[in-house]
């Protein structure tokens, strides 16, 4: 009979998790010469060490420190792109604008993007059946704590003008409870960051409203200004055209507004 397992509300560890993490690490270090020194086996050992044999509702940021140390990476000033509730477009953008970086363009974010993982207390097994759900089970689960840890570090190391892409189609364009609103905003360092520039991405083709006047954007401006960081906001009315113009800035249609 299979050993009794804690049943959580969330989906289990992503199939072939160890292999996936290692495959991604190898691929990343090959493509990024500045990370060639990274030993992927040590990265996997540190990743595993953060959650294996631990109760999956009692994970701390401290658990991930060995991994964070191994994955230390710096982004040039003015090149950090944060995002909230609009991951796909942010990633499409950095795939074209290769000198800008989201968290998922960095080693640790790249390793964990779209993956789920958890272990079990006192066993060396990975739980492929179920993992804690942030709402229904607990917030201090391996996945949530990982993203909180690496997001904090990513924000702390940002410098110059930091950009953030926000989803203008949502009821809360800026959400205080998102990772951006609860972690990244509060960990931007005023002595290193001169300004935060928000790009509000419009959803509807005919949407010509100025979403920079949205109350939640005003709330973001207030939080940022109180931290002695300047705030700017831009509407991106046509995200498709925006991406096209990043690819081909010389295109005549790109001289008009996007």
């Amino acid at each position: 009979l299979p050993r009794w397992r804690q049943q959580w509300s969330g989906s289990g560890t992503t199939s072939r998790f160890p292999e996936t993490v290692l495959a991604r690490c190898v691929k990343y270090t090959e493509v990024h010469p500045e990370m060639r020194h990274v030993d992927c086996q040590s990265v996997w050992d540190a990743f595993k060490g953060a959650f294996i044999s631990k109760y999956p509702c009692n994970i701390t940021e401290e658990d991930y420190q060995p991994l964070v140390k191994l994955g230390t990476q710096t982004v040039p000033c003015n090149k950090t792109l944060l995002w909230s509730r609009i991951k796909d477009l942010a990633h499409q953008f950095t795939q074209v604008q290769r000198d800008m970086f989201t968290l998922e363009d960095m080693l640790l974010g790249y390793l964990a993007d779209d993956l789920t993982w958890c272990g079990e207390f006192n066993t060396f097994e990975i739980n492929y059946q179920s993992c804690p759900d942030w709402r229904k089970d607990c917030s201090n689960n391996p996945v949530s704590v990982f993203w909180k840890t690496v997001s904090r570090r990513f924000a702390e190391t940002a410098c110059g003008v930091v950009h953030v892409m926000l989803n203008g189609s949502r009821s809360k364009i800026f959400d205080k409870n998102s990772t951006f609103g609860s972690v990244e905003v509060h960990n931007l360092q005023p002595e290193k960051v001169q300004a935060l520039e928000a790009w509000v991405i419009h959803g509807g083709r005919e949407d010509s409203r100025d979403l920079c006047q949205d109350p939640t954007i005003k709330e973001l401006e207030s939080i940022i200004s109180k931290r002695n960081i300047r705030f700017f906001c831009k509407n991106i009315y046509r995200p498709d055209k925006f991406l096209q113009c990043v690819k081909n800035p010389e295109d005549s249609s790109c001289l008009s507004g996007i």
Epitope: S15, R16, F17, E19, V26, T29, Y128
Partner: antibody, heavy 116, light 108 residues
Framework: QVQLVQSGAEVKKPGASVKVSCKVS????????IHWVRQAPGQGLEWMGG????????IYAQKFQGRVIMTEDTSTDTAYMEMNSLRSEDTAIYYC?????????WGQGTLVTVSS | EIILTQSPAILSLSPGERATLSCRAS???????LSWYQVKPGLAPRLLIY???TRATGIPVRFSGSGSGTDFSLTISSLQPEDCAVYYC?????????FGQGTRLEIK
């Protein structure tokens, strides 16, 4: 411990198909991918293909593309390798293997003889 | 595709002698993902070394691996009659996984 047990030897005629099974125990197919390797008489080891978790699909060596299908039944923890349009040069021992990036574990091998 | 080239193709030595087998990669291979196998007729490949230098479970200490980047080697410090086999290097850092063409070790 990890064990891979393969199906028995097969004798096939040219043009026929063969399906080799590989039952894993000591772990489940959700943990590690299966790869297939063959060794023809007097020849070296040749990787045929295997599951790439990063792309979420099976990658085949160019040589076997379109002629080999690798599948898995996670409910029984069994992997399968089916080869079509067999020819005499496909006579070989076929191995399933697992544990990429870690310690590789191998099945005992299945001898497939293609002869008219 | 990473091509692994082994040398020599055949090595003929006496018991007690030291054997050094070479494996050269067409591009840099992460050491952790370079393995060595021993293959005897009718038997499944036996993993000797993984991570370029770590002996697999149950492998005698006379087998050792070394190297990094594009040059790797397997050394058998004191040959035994049962070491007569074909030896293959393998890389699994990239798909397709590739093997060297093998070195046949003959014991005189």
């Amino acid at each position: 411990q990890v064990q891979l047990v393969q199906s028995g030897a097969e004798v096939k005629k040219p043009g026929a198909s063969v399906k080799v099974s590989c039952k894993v125990s000591g772990y489940t197919l959700t943990e590690f991918s299966i790869h297939w390797v063959r060794q023809a008489p007097g020849q070296g080891l040749e990787w045929m293909g295997g599951f790439d978790p990063e792309d979420g699909e099976t990658i085949y060596a160019q040589k076997f593309q379109g002629r080999v299908i690798m599948t898995e039944d996670t409910s029984t923890d069994t992997a399968y390798m089916e080869m079509n349009s067999l020819r005499s040069e496909d006579t070989a021992i076929y191995y399933c293997t697992t544990g990429r990036f870690f310690d590789w574990f191998w099945g005992q091998g299945t001898l497939v003889t293609v002869s008219s | 595709e990473i091509i692994l080239t082994q040398s020599p193709a055949i090595l003929s030595l006496s018991p007690g002698e030291r054997a050094t087998l070479s494996c050269r990669a067409s591009q840099s291979v992460i050491s952790r993902f370079l393995s060595w196998y021993q293959v005897k007729p009718g038997l499944a490949p036996r993993l000797l070394i993984y991570g370029a230098s770590t002996r697999a479970t149950g492998i005698p200490v006379r087998f050792s691996g070394s190297g990094s980047g594009t040059d790797f080697s397997l050394t058998i410090s004191s040959l035994q009659p049962e070491d007569c086999a074909v030896y293959y290097c393998q890389q699994d850092s990239n798909l397709p996984i590739t093997f060297g063409q093998g070195t046949r070790l003959e014991i005189k």
